[in-house]
Interface confidence: low
């Protein structure tokens, strides 16, 4: 699998030459460049940045760099009617109002076009009513409220703390519970790590800081008005009433200073247990409504944001492959930010920029990769992965025939403790082998490999001496490539110590305080973690594009399929009587997994032995590897989620960020004991087992000898 052999290049131009060209100082410089002004999707500033990146990628040496534009539904606050929440007394007077903006960080006081905190795609409205505190607004939180505490959220405004799950799931859950408005807030328990100062003196969230974000439930649809098809010049757009995934109730985010004012007056039921208490000096009463003296006061939301069809721009760069130009390895990350994007996304965009520069340097010296590499700077990721999804919709026929792999490149860091990787099992061995060749940047691991520090700090829960690699979920631009198109995908970044830091994400996520200085002062002053992430992402792209035989190991898929089958079987076995009554059997699934394991093993043996000098046989074997991920795609998609088509993995129906295995079966089994019609419910479980078993068997057969 030596990378040197791919294009008759000199030994100088191997992976080492590419990696050696990557420089921390350049990443630092690029990050600074990308974070001086806001780059909100749909704005002039972000268009100008797209043109700048296009120009620089051309200078770096890519063969072509084009802008791909789409007209998609975006959402913005009304500049003349700001959004806010008030407490009103019995006369309707506003006796308290939440802040209209975050206090700007030092040095940024004169920056214009900082979008105030808002929940993108919230409908307009001014609901007023009693407040109910719903913890994280997870499915289980509403179960606790409605089933155990008998609290009805219908007609109430709910207040939920950010964290644990994607905010869109919180809003969906609140809607289903009958709420007429949602207030989202950041609790210090989740966004203020003990012993660290708040920004600008540390990396914690100040009381006036607020997390922006979209609240859609798109389920992979892309632009809400053009699901399944690109939002191009001749697109047919749905009416807003038929748009995909829009929330139906007003939603607004606030910081913990404002949350304190709302929560301190709460009355009604006490919190059910300590897991419902945050770190504010308030009782965390659930409500509904305010306590005694304040019982006549209500909460009123004032939301005036508008949804607008707006032009967005992806930048697509191409480095043509010398041997297999019709095979695409894609490195993509988004460019749009909520404000300055110090971490999200520009810590990732700066790494992509340096990877492009390194590849360009090699190309200028006469080298080319074996396969074509596509580089993408996606727009409107923050508004629902729109740029990547529209581009993939426009190019789906090419991608499904030619797409080898997609490597995602959003934020390079969410901490500085150790590596974090989520990827298809096909890439496990690639990641293991690559990290064994890279130096660890971690203190105390000088002279040791990245693999060693990663394994020590984040061990696999199943396999001794190996690092944890997680399932792909969603909430980022790999979604359309993996979940819809079945292109092998992966992502890597540096993360925090999840054992000691239980807060959700990083404290300043999507706030105005996510600046260049946050990264340079507190997270990665030497940019050594950024460099390591560049080496991992870039190294993966290099190997995927340059290895003679694709660096995929199908045996690793066999291992996880067995693990996932065991897990879903054990969930089902929590209902032994029903399984017996309705004749539910997992035999077909376990049989398919067994077949897959045997066929994958035989394929791997053939892969070692075949004549790599025969280009037809080489191409045939590589195509079997490339199309394996594609074989897990069900063209009909998952129930009610047509754009989630991968049968082995999908974003959790309860948390878009998390990946779920055998999602069709999992969702059919979820809360099955509460279904009105158990016969129908268990019938759906059986149907989903059938779909999963068939898909695994069909995928196995793609690895069989072709004749």
């Amino acid at each position: 699998k030596s990378s040197n052999e791919a294009t008759n290049i000199t030994p100088k131009h191997n992976m080492k030459a590419f990696l050696d060209e990557l420089k921390a100082e350049n990443i630092k410089k690029f990050l600074y460049n990308f974070t001086q002004i806001p780059h909100l999707a749909g704005t002039e500033q972000n268009f100008q940045l797209a043109k700048q990146i296009q120009s620089q990628w051309k200078e770096f040496g890519l063969d072509s760099v084009e802008l791909a534009h789409y007209d998609v539904l975006l959402s913005y606050p009304n500049k003349t009617h700001p959004n806010y929440i008030s407490i009103i007394n019995e006369d309707g007077n506003e006796i308290f109002n939440t802040s209209l903006f975050e206090p700007p960080p030092p040095g940024y006081e004169n920056v214009s076009d900082i979008v105030p905190p808002f929940s993108a795609f919230s409908p307009q409205g001014m609901p007023e009513g009693d407040l109910v505190y719903v913890n994280y607004a997870r499915t289980e939180d509403f179960f606790k409220l409605e089933r155990d505490m008998k609290i009805n959220c219908s007609g109430k405004i709910v207040i939920a703390r950010y964290g644990k799950v994607f905010r869109g799931n919180k809003v969906k859950n609140a809607q289903l519970a009958g709420a007429k408005g949602v207030i989202l807030y950041s609790d210090p328990a989740d966004y203020f790590a003990p012993g660290v100062k708040s920004y600008p003196d540390g990396w914690n969230l100040p009381g006036g800081g607020v997390q922006r974000g979209n609240i859609l439930n798109l389920n992979g649809a892309g632009d809400p008005l053009t699901p399944g098809y690109p939002a191009n010049e001749y697109a047919y757009r749905r009416g807003i009433a038929e748009a995909v995934g829009l929330p139906s109730i007003p939603v607004h985010p606030i910081g913990y200073y404002d949350a304190q004012k709302l929560l301190e007056k709460m009355g009604g039921s006490a919190p059910p247990d300590s897991s419902w208490r945050g770190s504010l000096k308030v009782p965390y009463n659930v409500g509904p409504g305010f306590t005694g003296n304040f019982s006549t006061q209500k909460v009123k939301m004032h939301i005036h944001s508008t949804n607008e069809v707006t032009r967005i721009y992806n930048v697509i760069g191409t480095l043509r492959g010398a041997v297999e130009p019709d095979r695409y390895v894609i490195l993509g990350g988004h460019r749009d930010s909520w404000v300055f994007g110090g971490i999200d996304p520009q810590s990732g965009a700066a790494v992509v920029h340096e990877i492009v520069r390194s590849f360009g340097t090699l190309k200028k010296e006469g080298w080319r990769p074996r396969r074509t590499i596509l580089f993408a700077s996606w727009d409107a990721e923050e508004f629902g992965l729109l740029g990547s999804t529209e581009w993939a919709e426009e190019n789906s026929r090419l991608l499904q025939e030619r797409g080898v792999a997609y490597i995602n490149a959003d934020s390079s860091i969410e901490g500085n403790y150790t590596l974090r990787v989520d990827c298809t099992p096909l890439m496990y061995s690639l990641v293991h082998n690559l990290t064994k060749e890279l130096k660890s940047p971690d203190e105390g691991f000088e002279g040791k490999s990245l693999y060693e520090s990663w394994t020590k700090k984040s061990p696999s829960p199943e396999f001794s001496g190996m690092p944890r690699i997680s399932k792909l979920g969603s909430g980022n631009d790999f979604e359309v490539f993996f979940q819809r198109l079945g292109i092998a995908s992966g992502r890597a970044r540096y993360t925090k110590n999840w054992e000691t830091n239980k807060f959700s994400g990083y404290p300043l996520y999507h706030s105005v305080y996510e600046t260049y200085e946050l990264v340079e002062k507190f997270y990665d002053p030497m940019f050594k973690y950024h460099l390591t992430v560049a080496q991992v992402r870039g190294g993966m792209v290099f190997e995927l594009a340059n290895s003679i035989v694709l660096p995929f190991d199908c045996r690793d898929y066999a291992v996880v399929l067995r693990k996932y089958a065991d897990k879903i079987y054990s969930i089902s076995m929590k209902h032994p009587q029903e399984m017996k009554t309705y004749s539910v059997s997992f035999d077909s699934l376990f049989s398919a997994v067994k077949n897959f394991t045997e066929i994958a093993s035989k394929f791997s043996e053939r892969l070692q032995d075949f004549d790599k000098s025969n280009p037809i046989v080489l191409r045939m074997m590589n195509d079997q590897l490339m199309f394996l991920e594609r074989a897990f795609i069900d063209p009909l998609g998952l129930p009610d989620r047509p754009f989630y088509r991968h049968v082995i993995y999908a974003p959790s129906s309860h948390n878009k960020y998390a990946g779920e295995s055998f999602p069709g079966i999992y969702d059919a089994l979820f809360d099955i004991e509460s279904k009105v019609d158990p016969s129908k419910a268990w019938g759906e479980v059986k149907r989903q087992i059938y779909v999963a078993a068939f898909t695994v068997q069909a995928a196995a057969e793609t690895l069989s000898e072709v004749a």
Partner: antibody, heavy 116, light 107 residues
């Protein structure tokens, strides 16, 4: 308060040179791209060119009508942008304005007359 | 180059009137259109950016709309200080270009 003050205009013969200055105050000058726009007497507005910030490698872009003759530069330590005009033609006669990125703030303008 | 064609070239109106100025781009410029006001002997001032966003301090009687190729500036309840020349401009691509101007005069 954002302020832009142009200077350096005057009468010059065709083929001659002139250097305009734009002194900025009230904002972090080094972060912003600066444009020059001109307006001939009784006529409309014409964009001349722009210079970006240091983080954009001081990249410049020019209108076709001035390309090769005009050069935009900046000195961030002095909070000043410059427009060096060479090989001037009679049709370059205009009031020259410097503007901050996206033309959201304008100076009061300085008059350049090219005549023999 | 992208041409920005304004109409009408001049309009006579009275205080309290509603005035509408249109600007047509020769090709799609998204929403990257601004509107400027200029009074004799003074520099232009930005009124509207991004086709429909009022710049800081601009009275609410000024509004902008449109996208792609057709854009409109509307002045409701015309005030004495609004008599001036108005320009549209695009910043979608180089070279940035302006319309030829619309003069709003007292009837």
């Amino acid at each position: 308060e954002v302020q832009l003050v142009e200077s350096g205009g005057g009468l010059v013969q065709p083929g001659g040179s002139l250097k305009l200055s734009c002194a900025a105050s009230g904002f972090t000058f080094s972060n912003y791209w600066m444009n020059w726009v001109r307006q001939a007497s009784g006529k409309g507005l014409e964009w001349v060119g722009e210079i970006r910030s240091q983080s954009n490698n001081f990249a410049t872009h020019y209108a076709e009508s001035v390309k090769g003759r005009f050069t935009i530069s900046r000195d961030d330590s002095k909070n000043t942008a410059y427009l060096q005009m060479n090989s001037l033609k009679t049709e370059d006669t205009a009031v020259y304005y410097c503007t901050r990125r996206w033309n959201n703030f304008w100076g009061q303008g300085t008059t350049v007359t090219v005549s023999s | 180059d992208i041409q920005m064609t304004q109409s009408p070239s001049s309009v006579s109106a009275s205080v309290g009137d509603r005035v509408t100025i249109t600007c047509k781009a020769s090709e799609n410029v998204g929403t990257y259109v601004s509107w400027y006001q200029q009074k004799p002997g003074t520099a232009p001032k930005l009124l509207i950016y991004g086709a429909s966003n009022r710049f800081t301090g601009v009275p609410s009687r000024f509004s902008g709309s449109g996208s792609a190729t057709d854009f409109t500036l509307t002045i409701n309840n015309l005030q004495p200080e609004d008599f001036a020349t108005y320009y549209c401009g695009q910043s979608y691509t180089f070279p940035y270009t302006f319309g030829q101007g619309t003069k709003v005069e007292i009837k």
